[in-house]
């Protein structure tokens, strides 16, 4: 009956953690004697190829300084404890502690048997590092040039994490990779870039980080913050201002970041009706007269700059009953 070595083609282990490289001789055959078990790294330099051996009488040996005896152990293999007990070498699973990047590579598990001879199996050990992720908005001021408005950083991953963005805005991403502080790891930074305008302020975009150590992608929401000058509109004019009307009000509606620091009401004619009283963002009209046949201007200031809006007013002789109740900006 033929025997075979059962190994996993690939084993993944966390950087700094412990990994087991399974190795079993199958099937159990009466009279098949395992005289030695060895683990080798065929791709390593000659003096580091022999990783571990298990001799039925002498037990385990770990000759190479890398990984070294302090980081290696046989999980189940047992040497003969006396003349009356057999060694148990069918399970040659090797544990590797404190994984480093240098541990990555091919490992060959070999059973020297009698009378079948030598049989072996090979496992590829991959060392991975779970990255730490963070995303944050960059406080930017509106401009005509593309600017980084958000950063997503995946620190010290192995292999490098894949970063993408989910957003309905018109954007592009710029990615950089640098070596992490832990040897063999990579820190990936993705810059979410767009032409910053008020339309982007307060919008939530999502950084998506994918890595083989994650069960599912990491999704990190980021609320953009764009400083921009006031975007102004005027509401309250309903196209039904008539002489003597007393309940009219104009409102200066503003979107801005940061908040407005001042409102200024004026007219394009330069004449400001005395019955119109500015109260911050509102213009309260006590009684409409013919001086209101003008264009009102609301000018709003914030730390970034200013914005303005105009509203043309047409004063009627009598109320317009056809469109009464309609309001418009």
């Amino acid at each position: 009956q033929d025997v075979r070595v059962q190994v996993l083609p690939e084993v993944r282990g966390q950087l700094g953690g412990t990994v087991e490289l399974p190795c079993h001789l199958l099937p159990p055959v009466p009279g098949l004697y395992i005289s030695l078990v060895t683990w080798q790294r065929p791709d390593a330099p000659a003096n580091h190829q022999n990783v571990a051996a298990f001799h039925p009488k002498m037990g385990p040996s770990f000759p190479s300084p890398k990984p070294g005896s302090e980081r290696l152990s046989f999980v189940s293999a047992k040497q003969s404890t006396g003349q009356d007990t057999e060694a148990e070498l069918q399970d040659a699973t090797l544990a590797l502690h404190g994984l480093t990047v240098e541990d990555e590579g091919n490992y060959t598990c070999e059973f020297a048997t009698f009378p079948k001879g030598s049989v072996r199996g090979m496992t590829w050990l991959r060392v991975i590092a779970k990255p730490k992720n963070q995303a944050e908005a960059q406080k930017v001021t509106f401009s005509q040039d593309p600017t980084t408005v958000a950063l997503c950083i995946s620190k010290e991953g192995r292999p490098p994490a894949r970063i993408s963005w989910l957003s309905s805005l018109d954007w592009e991403a710029k990615e950089t990779q640098v070596s992490g502080t832990l040897a063999g790891t990579v820190t990936v930074t993705s810059r979410f870039t767009l032409v910053p305008s008020g339309r982007a302020d307060g919008v939530t975009v999502t950084c998506k980080v994918e890595h083989e150590s994650f069960e599912e992608p990491a999704l990190i929401p980021v609320t953009l913050s764009v400083r921009y000058p006031p975007e102004v509109s005027i509401s309250g004019y309903d196209d039904n201002w008539y002489l003597g009307r007393t309940d009219a009000t104009l409102s200066c509606d503003v979107r801005s970041n940061p908040e407005p620091t001042g409102y200024d009401w004026s007219t394009t004619s330069g004449t400001f009706p005395t019955s119109a009283v500015a109260q911050g963002s509102q213009l309260v009209i006590h009684a409409v007269d013919s001086l209101f046949n003008t264009t009102f201007v609301c000018t709003v200031t914030n730390a970034v700059g200013m914005g303005r809006a105009e509203q043309v007013i047409f004063v009627r002789e009598t109320p317009n009953t056809a469109g009464a109740g309609a309001t418009g900006g």
Epitope: S35, L36, N50, H55, D84, E110, F114, S118
Partner: antibody
Framework: EVQLVQSGTELKKPGSSVKVSCKAS????????IHWVRQPPGKGLEWIGA????????NYNQKFKARATITAVTSTSTAYMELSSLTSEDSAVYYC?????????WGQGTTVTVSS | DIVMTQSPSFLSASVGDRVSVTCKAS??????VVWYQQRAGQPPKTLIY???YRYSGVPDRFTGSGSGTDFTLTISSLQSEDLAEYFC?????????FGQGTKLEIK
């Protein structure tokens, strides 16, 4: 303590047979293969074959398969190697040995001289 | 069968010398090689197993190296008690085969 004690010196005529014994003690006899290795005077070592006392399975070097018979008697913990059709080329020290990783335990050797 | 060609067959050296014995396998045997020391009138004793692993109680002046088809036993500083014959053996493939031996003489 593991011990393998072999039978004494044999002087044989060409064409005859010799049967060498190896009595084992200090371990479970049925759990390990007993191997036979010979060494002609001033020459190297040559593996003849082995027996597994647990099920009497045997395994031979093809060179000796037609002439060698390796057996084991569990009741006495003794292994035997019989070699037939002897010639002067078979004059050698014959060792029984127990494989524990390597050939770690050896009998003291049995000198077989084939001469007319 | 795998042929193990050992050289030299005879070696004469002085105490303190560094000496090497080589063994060449006729086909790849991995690291499945043992080195034995046989003193006159005694059975062989294991020095090295799996090509480079020193057996329990063997002085560290004995080292083994090699893999595949080429193997070396080195004695870093020869001692008078090293007077013996040295054999390599492969256990990669049945039947086990031995080198023809190297007789070491102390000058």
């Amino acid at each position: 303590e593991v011990q393998l004690v072999q039978s004494g010196t044999e002087l044989k005529k060409p064409g005859s047979s010799v049967k060498v014994s190896c009595k084992a003690s200090g371990y479970i006899f049925t759990s390990y293969w007993i191997h036979w290795v010979r060494q002609p005077p001033g020459k190297g070592l040559e593996w003849i074959g082995a027996v597994y006392p647990g099920n009497s399975d045997s395994n031979y070097n093809q060179k000796f398969k037609a002439r060698a018979t390796i057996t084991a008697v569990t009741s006495t913990s003794t292994a035997y190697m019989e070699l037939s059709s002897l010639t002067s080329e078979d004059s050698a020290v014959y060792y029984c040995t127990k494989l524990v990783g390597t050939f770690d335990y050896w009998g003291q050797g049995t000198t077989v001289t084939v001469s007319s | 069968d795998i042929v193990m060609t050992q050289s030299p067959s005879f070696l004469s050296a002085s105490v303190g010398d560094r000496v090497s014995v080589t063994c060449k396998a006729s086909q790849n045997v991995g690291i499945n090689v043992v080195w034995y020391q046989q003193r006159a009138g005694q059975p062989p004793k294991t020095l090295i197993y799996s090509a480079s692993y020193r057996y329990s109680g063997v002085p560290d002046r004995f080292t083994g190296s090699g893999s595949g088809t080429d193997f070396t036993l080195t004695i870093s500083s020869l001692q008078s008690e090293d007077l013996a014959e040295y054999f390599c053996q492969q256990y990669n493939t049945n039947p086990f085969t031995f080198g023809q031996g190297t007789k070491l003489e102390i000058k």
